[in-house]
């Protein structure tokens, strides 16, 4: 039985040319994590592997950063940033969680509506 | 998983006061923008109000026809936000959304609760 | 304020067959900042297609959604029963944010 709950950074509005942290915690669930993938859709951005560490996609390695902890920076974000990235905890035994963090880059214009890198 | 519920909703006559709340879970809740969304029986959607976090002052936002009657709040210790009601008219009936959103996009919604202004 | 007109209201179409509806804003809207929801009778609305053109995760991919300016649509390729909803627009060029009327689409 899957007893574990993932919490997420929620919704993330940054400025274009900036960085973030997407961030999940896996709690309630005493399960071992064994891996945790980042992904995109259906693109793969990052694996941290709990014996092999941590893989950047060859297609994203010069954006993205690996942590802190389990989570992942992005970096030099664009507006086709914008979207929703899934944090996947391959966990034993409870198998695996899911969770959905949706990201907006803006424009200046529109981010100076708000502080200079993150505009929650 | 992102919960959002909303409670408080119910039947007030015109004129009249009420205080909707909504409680989250699931995510950073004193990170996130929040923001209350009406929909009038068998009408479209009416983004009503907005707050932001701590680290935008809390700033709000009104649509023009709530400003100055309606109140958005938050307790982000407690992962709650809040749209106190005061003036309430019949034109307010509607089923009240809690959404979570970035700048622009709402991309977290609650179930709604029914508000019914009528004498 | 930036209003948004959607047409038409209500359309019906046959399971198989391709539908457009469209989006109209007042003023210009940046393409980045102009989303569709689609809510089911008696349901909350769900995040449908962001910044013009991208599907929310689950969203099948007979959608898209394309424009620029003050004209923007969504497109279902090939119509299914439960594509049955409503579909709002909605933009942000500063407060307040604003939604379309909707269009509700029936399924013959």
């Known amino acids: 039985m899957m007893t574990g709950t993932i919490e997420t950074t929620g919704n993330i509005s940054a400025e274009k040319g900036g960085s973030i942290i997407l961030q999940c915690h896996l709690s309630s669930t005493t399960a071992q994590v064994t891996q945790v993938n980042w992904e995109q859709q259906d693109q793969l951005l990052a694996i941290c592997n709990a014996d092999l560490g941590w893989h950047i996609s060859p297609s994203f390695k010069d954006r993205v950063a690996p942590g802190p902890g389990l989570g992942l920076t992005l970096q030099s974000l664009t507006v086709n940033d914008t979207g929703e990235y899934f944090c996947i905890y391959h966990t034993y035994p409870d198998g695996t969680y899911t969770g959905r963090i949706f990201l907006e880059v803006l424009e200046s214009s529109v981010a100076e509506h708000g502080a200079r890198f993150q505009i929650p | 998983e992102v919960q959002l519920v909303e409670t408080g909703g119910g039947l007030v006559q015109p004129k009249g006061s009420l205080n909707l709340s909504c409680a989250a879970s699931g995510f950073t809740f004193n990170t996130n923008a929040m923001n209350w969304v009406r929909q009038a029986p068998g009408k479209g959607l009416e983004w009503v109000a907005r707050?932001?976090?701590?680290?935008?002052?809390?700033?709000?936002y009104y649509a023009d026809s709530v400003k100055d009657r309606f109140t958005i709040s938050r307790d982000d210790s407690q992962s709650m936000l809040y749209l106190q009601m005061n003036n309430l008219k019949t034109e307010d009936t509607a089923m009240y959304y809690c959404?979570?959103?970035?700048?622009?996009?709402?991309?977290?919604w609650g179930q709604g609760t029914l508000v019914t202004v009528s004498a | 304020e930036n209003v948004l007109t959607q047409s038409p209201a209500i359309m019906s179409a046959s399971p198989g067959e391709k539908v457009t509806m469209t989006c109209r804003a007042s003023?210009?809207?940046?393409?980045?900042?102009l989303h569709w929801y689609q809510q089911k009778s008696g349901a909350s609305p769900k995040l449908w297609i962001y910044t013009t053109s991208k599907l929310a995760s689950g969203v099948p991919a007979r959608f898209s959604g394309s424009g620029s300016g003050t004209s923007y649509s969504l497109t279902i390729s090939s119509v299914e029963a439960e594509d049955a909803a409503t579909y709002y627009c909605?933009?942000?060029?500063?407060?307040?944010?604003?939604f379309g009327g909707g269009t509700k689409l029936e399924i013959k």
């Open positions: 003023s210009s809207v940046s393409s980045s900042y």
């Open positions: 909605q933009q942000y060029s500063g407060y307040p944010l604003t």
């Open positions: 959404v979570g959103s970035t700048m622009t996009i709402f991309s977290y």
């Open positions: 707050i932001r976090s701590k680290s935008n002052n809390y700033a709000t």
